[in-house]
Amino acid sequence: VPGEAEQPAPELVEVEVGSTALLKCGLSQSQGNLSHVDWFSVHKEKRTLIFRVRQGQGQSEPGEYEQRLSLQDRGATLALTQVTPQDERIFLCQGKRPRSQEYRIQLRVYKAPEEPNIQVNPLGIPVNSKEPEEVATCVGRNGYPIPQVIWYKNGRPLKEEKNRVHIQSSQTVESSGLYTLQSILKAQLVKEDKDAQFYCELNYRLPSGNHMKESREVTVPVFYPTEKVWLEVEPVGMLKEGDRVEIRCLADGNPPPHFSISKQNPSTREAEEETTNDNGVLVLEPARKEHSGRYECQGLDLDTMISLLSEPQELLVNYVSDVRVSPAAPERQEGSSLTLTCEAESSQDLEFQWLREETGQVLERGPVLQLHDLKREAGGGYRCVASVPSIPGLNRTQLVNVAIFGPPWMAFKERKVWVKENMVLNLSCEASGHPRPTISWNVNGTASEQDQDPQRVLSTLNVLVTPELLETGVECTASNDLGKNTSILFLELVNLTTLTPDSNTTTGLSTSTASPHTRANSTSTERKLPEPESRG
């Protein structure tokens, strides 16, 4: 055709996949009558008639475009709906009168790819690989035309680098005509890449301009040999007996080597392997002073069979030995003096304190306690506490009982007890003295004795309340080598009109079940005895 070489460049129409392309026939009135036009699609230089316009009326030709074409804009524009990548071609309109002229339109089709899917090598990358390894893949699905991929490491674009970085991209055409791009990043990584953030970016074009989509950032498992092995002890700081102590091996390699922990035998000075748990941790629970010593860790790389040894670490489990008090069982006469001395060993400086056991009162700060002009009340428990001030909770104690010679001393001299006839009464009587007294009762019943401490005794008696008992009352007598003493319990019948017994009679430690009212230091348990059998 003459003059074909001078054909003007086709008009460019850009649309996204799935939208409608408006193909406007650009013939001027002088070039042709738009009421009489033929539309063609050009594919591989082959023209195919797809649409006719006659007297302003449009008619699709049978074929792939039959259902998707319609006339718009009073016949000047051909609308192509549901655009696909296969529609990217030249369309031309040809006017028939007064002479044949044509106008060409280049349809460009675009589709944004899906979000890039990045995947990391699930097995990881060894730093000593001989060739670049597959680090990650980036897949951009269903884009058109083929998007461009850029790989980033720590925010910087990665460039091809011989024997170091290689980017291998390939694409497949889906049945839809859309492209799926797969890019594989191959690289030789170094130890420092263990924390590196990689991502890929897809660059693509739409009618609106250039766009990009980024994948999520990923880190790559990097394997590198161990160069250093060391020990770590938890808790940090001063350790004491009774603590839970964990000794673990650590290494700067990935994966870590196989660990073993050894302790130096103080007598042979040989390293002896300790038993660790499944995680390779040596747990000392409870820690004892014998656990003190020199520990070291060995890391064995099972691939290379290279063994590394840690710096030895000295472990000190602080302790306080058993506390010794002298004299151990002191006995003194009233009015005399007594010196109590406390001793203990420790891995640290010790502080001593003397406390009165019964009250918790601090009597002395120091290992020696001096007691002068001893009274009977000075008898009882004294506790020495040996502690390490620099390590809270590290202390040991020893209790010593001071005995003051003297006859029995009663907790009360006399007391009134409210009772009901036929009830079982539970009475108690307490006495102290040195030597420790024994208690006897003046009535028959079930008596039991409990030693409260080396100088004190408590006796309880279960007895049935009878008229005779109400008359005589009950006496308890405490006796030792140095004398005897008595307490009297007066029994009074509870009268229903009696509201409150005389309050000054309810002192002391005797307990009874007689009173319906609660008394300080008294308990009551009432039990009905079976009626006696009647004999005919």
Epitope: Q119, P126, S129
Partner: antibody, heavy 116, light 106 residues
Framework: QVQLKESGPGLVQSSQTLSLTCTVS????????VSWVRQPPGKGLEWIAA???????YYNSAFKSRLSISRNTSKSQVLLKMNSLQTEDTGMYFC??????????WGQGVMVTVSS | DIQVTQSPSLLSASVGDRVTLNCKGS??????LAWFRLKRGEAPKLLIY???SLQTGIPSRFSGSGSGTDFTLTITSLQPEDVATYFC????????FGAGTKLELK
């Protein structure tokens, strides 16, 4: 087309060493990695070991101390050695091609029986 | 290690049925999941990779979906040749397989 074929002894005595070969065609071992996977009778699949296109080797930590994987690129073969065999190692052993991280082609498998 | 749990372990269905198999990861594996079909005496066959990509040559009645921890393999119209054991596999960190779903005809 891509093909993988496993070969090796059908019967092995316990405590002995198992040697399996995976012969590949239709691709190069320097382009794709290869994994070994096994399936004990009536059980699921279990990944054993892999060799990457770059020649790096990887092992399932459950077997690591008794495994060795290697390749002969000129013969297009991947070799797996497993020592100290027990009866629990009985099963079907497969080799599979990496693409690059999932397995796109597998061999038909070789049945290995460990007898006591 | 990442665990992969498959359900159900056994599934009976009729020809033409829509069949759904499930796979659950013990942690987020994004889309690093593949589905395989295993028939006795045959090489295992890759059906789906990257959670939802259909492997070349696999009929379009197979489809995969899901991301993160929950994944599904769907067969829209069950065919007699689909009777097999189906496995899912994660390749996000190491390689682990589900215990399998045995699919049989009613």
């Amino acid at each position: 087309q891509v093909q993988l074929k496993e070969s090796g002894p059908g019967l092995v005595q316990s405590s002995q060493t198992l040697s399996l070969t995976c012969t590949v065609s239709g691709f190069s071992l320097t382009s794709n990695g290869v994994s070994w996977v096994r399936q004990p009778p009536g059980k699921g699949l279990e990944w054993i070991a892999a060799i990457s296109s770059g020649g790096s080797t990887y092992y399932n930590s459950a077997f690591k101390s008794r495994l060795s994987i290697s390749r002969n690129t000129s013969k297009s073969q991947v070799l797996l050695k497993m020592n100290s065999l027990q009866t629990e190692d009985t099963g079907m052993y497969f080799c599979a091609r990496h693409r690059p991280f999932y397995f796109d082609y597998w061999g038909q498998g070789v049945m290995v029986t460990v007898s006591s | 290690d990442i665990q992969v749990t498959q359900s159900p372990s056994l599934l009976s269905a009729s020809v033409g049925d829509r069949v759904t198999l499930n796979c659950k990861g013990s942690q987020n594996i994004y889309k690093s999941l593949a589905w395989f079909r295993l028939k006795r005496g045959e090489a295992p066959k890759l059906l789906i990779y990257d959670a939802n990509s259909l492997q070349t040559g696999i009929p379009s009645r197979f489809s995969g979906s899901g991301s993160g921890t929950d994944f599904t393999l769907t067969i829209t119209s069950l065919q007699p040749e689909d009777v097999a054991t189906y496995f899912c596999q994660q390749y996000y960190s190491g390689y682990t397989f589900g215990a399998g779903t045995k699919l049989e005809l009613k």
